[in-house]
């Protein structure tokens, strides 16, 4: 059937529409297009005789029409008057006529709408506002947007006049938003510019900031007032009911106790005619003096003296606070506070009690800190240390020994050789030493303030021959896969090379072996039972060499999973059962047995004479190493057959 399709059906003014012909018959003589629903010569647009390639414009031709070989009609620059029906009249070769009608609708391209309002400055909780979308356009749909969102559901929002008017009843400040209207028809949609609703409101109850109400004498008082209001509120300040000034901020420099009182902020909105006030009470306190610390002992002696620190001045009804090293006081039996916290006593002072110490006086507003005080604790001397640590020297070298002892005030030093005073210096220097310089070298440290003295003696051997070294160990019984062992070759000697042997061989390459301290120390990480070997260290210089006695490393290990022998598991009734348990372990483990879960004897061998089928069951051997703290076990099933029955065969 011949049909006409309009593409598009809804056409915008100025655009074009194609009347597309479907199912055009074969063998045509010609066809004509007419405006309207019927064939009317006065309303012919175009006629066409097939094959002439010459279409003839009719009375209704406007110059905007183009006809195509497939009979489709294109109309350009569409105008409102083009709306309606179009009829195609087809004349077939047998002169039989066929007709089809199509239609389209023309809509104007909508203009950009605008919003008019009946109230430009509505008052909150009082007024209503009606927005109207202009212009009024036929066949247009009206939509509204608030902050670019569709209208919220609200009993205060009402659409009327075909949705052209939006009314907001009883406006609130939250209605202050961007409002847009949109017009739509089948061919276009246009949005207005946004209109911002200006809702007059407030003032709300003002807030005074800052919130603090207590001040110190001599400070500046700076109060600010704010109240939500549109238009912005006008502010006035009253102190104790007396008007001060019409500003949002109130500033009073260098306040005194006399400035205490009630401070009122009044906010006024000239458009709504409303006033609101807020009152705050300000208290001004007198400024306390800056505290300072006094001490009953300016140079206390360590472990002998106590020190009492007192926070001055004494003020009634005041809280005293203390800090040590900028921290609050630690809990310590050596620290005591008096009842009023004003005096801090340090019992039996140590060198670590130097401070600094601060005290503070707390009032209603703040804490005033004293300047820090540092204690001069007299201590020492501690046992002096002589360096370097070498004890063996070769003839001809220079001997340079230095002595140091922790002490306050710093210690005075003296050197003695074999009991004879040498010099009163911290360092002792002897050039080009010989075997005669061997002996006992004593450093004496003296603290003149405490009167205490301490000495350290070092044996110095000057010899071309090196002594026989020895090996010291930090762990005599290391546990396998757990401990590390550090061997050190003694003594420490100057210009000496240190060597190590294991079982008479040079050290193997292993990530678990590490040499340090000039090869003087050999560390074995994560020891294993295989490390239980003979270790020898050697020392050598250009003149001599010497080796230590071997030290055998005793590695604690195990117990490993035990083995029960013999391996047999089937026995004949009447035989003797003699099971032996063994587990690799250092030291040897303790053994115990369980039969079917029941504890038996604590022996390495389990013996049962003349067994019967009643002795069937599970035999467990438990091993325990008290040194490593480790345990292990194994279970064996024993089957006893009645005599005359071969193991594995049933009668």
């Amino acid at each position: 059937k011949l049909t006409i399709e309009s593409t598009p059906f809804n056409v915008a003014e100025g655009k074009e529409v194609l009347l597309l012909v479907h199912n055009l018959p074969q063998h045509l003589f010609g066809y004509s297009w007419y405006k309207g629903e019927r064939v009317d010569g006065n309303r012919q647009i175009i006629g066409y005789v097939i094959g002439t390639q010459q279409a003839t414009p009719g009375p209704a031709y406007s110059g905007r029409e183009i006809i195509y070989p497939n009979a489709s009609l294109l109309i350009q620059n569409i105008i409102q008057n083009d709306t309606g029906f179009y009829t195609l009249h087809v004349i077939k070769s047998d002169l039989v006529n066929e007709e089809a009608t199509g239609q389209f609708r023309v809509y104007p391209e909508l203009p950009k709408p605008s919003i008019s309002s009946n109230n430009s400055k509505p008052v909150e909780d009082k007024d209503a506002v009606a927005f109207t979308c202009e212009p009024e356009t036929q066949d247009a749909t009206y939509l509204w947007w608030v902050n670019n969102q569709s209208l919220p559901v609200s009993p205060r929002l009402q659409l009327s006049n075909g949705n052209r008017t939006l009314t907001l009843f009883n406006v609130t400040r939250n209605d202050t938003a961007s409002y847009k209207c949109e017009t739509q028809n089948p061919v276009s949609a246009r949005r207005s510019d946004s209109v911002i609703l200006n809702v007059l409101y407030g003032p709300d109850a003002p807030t005074i900031s800052p919130l603090n109400t207590s001040y110190r004498s001599g400070e500046n008082l700076n109060l600010s007032c704010h109240a939500a209001s549109n238009p912005p509120a006008q502010y006035s300040w009253f102190v104790n009911g007396t008007f001060q000034q019409s500003t949002q901020e109130l500033f009073i420099p260098n306040i005194t106790v006399n400035n205490s009182g009630s401070y009122t902020c009044q906010a006024h909105n000239s458009d709504t005619g409303l006033n609101r006030t807020t009152v705050t009470t300000i208290t001004v306190y007198a400024e306390p003096p800056k505290p300072f610390i006094t001490s009953n002992n300016s140079n206390p002696v360590e472990d002998e003296d106590a020190v009492a620190l007192t926070c001055e001045p004494e003020i009634q009804n005041t809280t005293y606070l203390w800090w040590v090293n900028n921290q609050s006081l630690p809990v310590s039996p050596r620290l005591q506070l008096s009842n009023d916290n004003r005096t801090l006593t340090l019992l039996s002072v140590t060198r670590n009690d130097v401070g600094p110490y601060e005290c503070g006086i707390q009032n209603e507003l703040s804490v005033d800190h004293s300047d820090p005080v540092i204690l001069n604790v007299l201590y020492g001397p501690d046992d002096p240390t002589i360096s370097p640590s070498y004890t063996y020297y070769r003839p001809g070298v220079n001997l340079s020994l230095s002595c140091h002892a922790a002490s306050n005030p710093p210690a005075q030093y003296s050197w003695l050789i074999d009991g004879n005073i040498q010099q009163h210096t911290q360092e002792l220097f002897i050039s080009n030493i010989t075997e005669k310089n061997s002996g006992l070298y004593t450093c004496q440290a003296n603290n003149s303030a405490s009167g205490h003295s301490r000495t350290t003696v070092k044996t110095i051997t000057v010899s071309a021959e090196l002594p026989k070294p020895s090996i010291s160990s930090n762990n005599s019984k290391p546990v396998e896969d757990k401990d590390a062992v550090a061997f050190t070759c003694e003594p420490e000697a100057q210009n000496t090379t240190y060597l190590w042997w294991v079982n008479g061989q040079s050290l193997p390459v292993s990530p678990r072996l590490q040499l340090s301290n000039g090869n003087r120390t050999l560390t074995l990480f994560n020891v294993t039972r295989n490390d239980a070997r003979a270790y020898v260290c050697g020392i050598q210089n250009s003149v001599s060499a010497n080796r230590s006695d071997p030290v055998t490393l005793d590695v604690l290990y195990g117990p490993d999973t035990p083995i029960i022998s013999p391996p047999d598991s089937s026995y004949l009734s009447g035989a003797n059962l003699n099971l032996s348990c063994h587990s690799a372990s250092n030291p040897s483990p303790q053994y115990s047995w369980r039969i079917n879960g029941i504890p038996q004897q604590h022996t390495q061998v389990l013996f049962i004479a003349k067994i019967t089928p009643n002795n069937n069951g599970t035999y467990a051997c438990f091993v325990s190493n008290l040194a490593t703290g480790r345990n292990n076990s194994i279970v064996k099933s024993i089957t006893v057959s009645a005599s005359g029955t071969s193991p594995g065969l049933s009668a």
């Epitope: 175009i46 066409y48 094959g51 002439t52 390639q53 010459q54 279409a55 414009p57 406007s62 110059g63 029409e65 183009i66 006809i67 195509y68 070989p69």
Partner: antibody, heavy 120, light 107 residues
């Protein structure tokens, strides 16, 4: 794009024959009529007639009956203008044009023109 | 045959000028009047058909008007590229006939 491409200039003696070609592209050649227009510098443009590209039937304006012939090669989308027994007054530029529309009272596409010079 | 007359064979104008070219038919041609532009290199283009319909791609400074026997082509704001000869053509009755042309030059 839609275009008509014409053959190059011709220099002929009186009494000879000339054949000008016009090749169409960018549309279905047999859908729309093809017209020929003569331009003499002094006398302006003169419509010579047209040919039905579907049937090959020519139509000539009164002044161009006799020595003038329109023809087609639809397989090549080409039309031809042949002038027999050339005269000096045939010296002109000849344009092919098409409405590219069934409404052929205007010509939307023109060839670049072919200049024919007839001189002894 | 319908005679088409362009009384002005040439005119001079300045760039930016408004230029109007007229065309008269020997009888009523019922708006079937077309305008063509021929550039100095000889190429011909359709500008306006059916008195006032602007062909797609033609600048909007060109416009056409008229009815009955009197028609005109207006160039609102003459540009350098508009230097050409303009022909009118009637499409009411065969044979189609052209005006003699109006040549537009720069002063």
């Amino acid at each position: 794009q839609i275009q008509l491409v014409q053959s190059g200039p011709e220099l002929k003696k009186p009494g000879e024959t000339v054949k000008i070609s016009c090749k169409a592209s960018g549309y279905t050649f047999t859908d729309y009529s093809l017209h020929w227009v003569k331009q003499v510098p002094v006398k302006g443009l003169k419509w010579m007639g047209w040919i039905n590209t579907e049937t090959g039937e020519p139509t000539y304006a009164d002044d161009f009956k006799g020595r003038f012939a329109f023809s087609l090669d639809t397989s090549a989308s080409s039309a031809y203008l042949q002038i027999h027994n050339l005269k000096n007054e045939d010296t002109a530029t000849y344009f092919c044009a098409s409405p590219v529309s069934l409404l052929f009272y205007y010509f939307t596409v023109w060839g670049a023109g072919t200049t024919v010079t007839v001189s002894a | 045959d319908i005679q088409m007359t362009q009384t002005t064979s040439s005119l001079s104008a300045s760039l930016g000028d408004r230029v109007t070219i007229s065309c008269r038919a020997s009888q009523d041609i019922s708006h079937f009047l077309n305008w063509y532009q021929q550039k100095p290199d000889g190429t011909v283009e359709l500008l306006i058909y059916y008195t006032s319909r602007l062909l797609s791609g033609v600048p909007s400074r060109f416009s056409g008007s008229g009815s009955g026997t009197d028609y005109s082509l207006t160039i609102a704001n003459l540009e350098q590229e508009d230097i050409a000869t303009y022909f009118c053509q009637q499409g009411k009755t065969l044979p189609w006939t052209f005006g003699g042309g109006t040549k537009v030059e720069i002063k």
